[in-house]
């Protein structure tokens, strides 16, 4: 196997790799730096691994993973050394790393010439108390948003930032806006961006008006 | 209104684990804010220690974070701090606080607002 | 880290007086992240101001904030006896969240 890559997203996580297996099986293993390797997906034809149950676990550590290959009938086949072959994944950490899947506004009111913005606060696969976190439980403040926000008659842009998952702006009487958002973890070196949310504009059914 | 109480021993031991509680009183801990812990060393300015959300994500000093655990329990409406290998260095008044979120600019930044009295903590053998 | 140094480290002034304290950051900080708090002998911080200008609930309109990027003022107008404390300038935007070393205001 070759090309291990990572396809995280609100860490629902998924090892892929080549070639599409002609004779040969997979199996995966996965561990964190300290820990013991896990194996799942056993003797698979697929080429690729969920791996989010493992590594929702625990999102700050650091994950590697491992790719077996085992001919098609013979799964003792091993290498030169005696192992069987594999290959290792590039290093993983969720926290750091897992995409930030596109937001959703959740809903919009105006109440004169304010409008509160609310943004979904979507849910994760991570758990805690048997409970599912959503996105803001677990990262916290470290996890901003953006909003663009622009009157329906032109292009000009304004954008607003906040710590939770609600806006409160100021618009011009009379006028219509669209909104879009942006999730956004300013501490991160990598995937620190969300792609846009769908825009959304006053005058249609997520929105509330209000003297 | 919400009240902050700091709770634990004054007088610890070098290389021991310093634990302070935090009980939050006129409010629910699972309400939105964050909650943090602050020290302030004899004479001296203020300290950041972490804060905790009441999910338990957490942040940390990380001149602090390898000996520094926070953590939350929400059924006592408590948030602890655990500070291990303790020096004379840790030797300072401990203050809990909560975080919460004020309209700024069109959207919404977490300050610290509401502060336990503080306690003082002496590590000395 | 950012750091946040204050000045001047004492301020000597009689109750009446305008006092303007400064606060300069190593680096930019987002007004949004700027906050001020006041501290009395035996007391906690008491938090003042928010967003580098807004003044916190209950707090008297004689203290104002002002300033951008690297370097904020705390303004109190008019000194009134209850004023005389140390006060200290933080950020909250970037982790270590980093208070100013304070300025003390005393009665000259």
């Known amino acids: 196997a070759f090309n291990l890559t990572w396809i995280s997203t609100d860490f629902k996580t998924i090892l892929e790799w080549q070639p599409k297996p002609t004779n040969y099986t997979y199996t995966v293993q996965i561990s964190t730096k300290s820990g013991d390797w896990k194996s799942k997906c056993f003797y698979t034809t697929d080429t690729e691994c969920d791996l989010t149950d493992e590594i929702v676990k625990d999102v700050k550590q650091t994950y590697l993973a491992r790719v077996f290959s085992y001919p098609a009938g013979n799964v003792e086949s091993t290498g030169s050394a005696g192992e069987p072959l594999y290959e290792n994944s590039p290093e993983f950490t969720p926290y750091l790393e897992t995409n930030l899947g596109q937001p959703t506004i959740q809903s919009f009111e105006q109440v004169g010439t304010k409008v509160n913005v609310t943004v979904e606060d979507e849910r994760t696969l991570v758990r805690r108390n048997n409970t599912f976190l959503s996105l803001r439980d677990v990262f916290g403040k470290d996890l901003i948003y953006t909003l663009y926000y622009w009157k329906s008659s032109s292009s000009g842009k304004k954008t607003a930032k906040t710590n939770t998952n609600e806006f409160l702006i100021d618009v011009d009487k009379g006028e219509n806006y669209c909104f879009s958002v942006q999730a956004v973890i300013p501490s991160r070196t990598v995937n620190r961006k969300s792609t846009d949310s769908p825009v959304e504009c006053m005058g249609q059914e997520k929105g509330e008006f209000r003297e | 209104q919400v009240q902050l109480q700091e709770s634990g021993p004054g007088l610890v031991k070098p290389s021991q684990t310093l634990s302070l509680t935090c009980t939050v009183s006129g409010g629910s801990i699972s309400s939105g804010q964050y909650w943090s812990w602050i020290r302030q060393h004899p004479g001296k300015g203020l300290e950041w220690i972490g804060e905790i959300y009441y999910s338990g994500s957490t942040r940390y000093n990380p001149s602090l974070k390898s000996r520094v655990t926070i953590s939350v329990d929400t059924s006592k409406n408590q948030f602890s701090l655990k500070l291990s290998s303790v020096t004379a260095a840790d030797t300072a008044v401990y203050y809990c606080a909560r975080d919460t979120p004020y309209y700024y600019d069109g959207g919404y930044y977490y300050y610290m607002d509401v502060w336990g009295k503080g306690t003082t903590v002496t590590v000395s053998s | 880290e950012i750091v946040l140094t204050q000045s001047p480290g004492t301020l000597s002034l009689s109750p009446g007086e305008r006092a303007t304290l400064s606060c300069r950051a190593s680096?930019?900080?987002?007004?949004?992240?700027l906050a001020w708090y006041q501290q009395k002998p035996g007391q906690a911080p008491r938090l003042l101001i928010y967003g580098a200008s807004s003044r916190a609930t209950g707090i008297p309109d004689r203290f104002s904030g002002s300033g951008s990027g690297t370097d904020f003022t705390l303004t109190i107008s008019r000194l009134e006896p209850e004023d005389f404390a140390v006060y200290y300038c933080?950020?909250?935007?970037?982790?270590?969240?980093?208070f100013g070393g304070g300025t003390k205001v005393e009665i000259k």
């Open positions: 680096q930019s900080v987002s007004s949004s992240y």
């Open positions: 933080q950020q909250v935007g970037v982790v270590p969240y980093t």
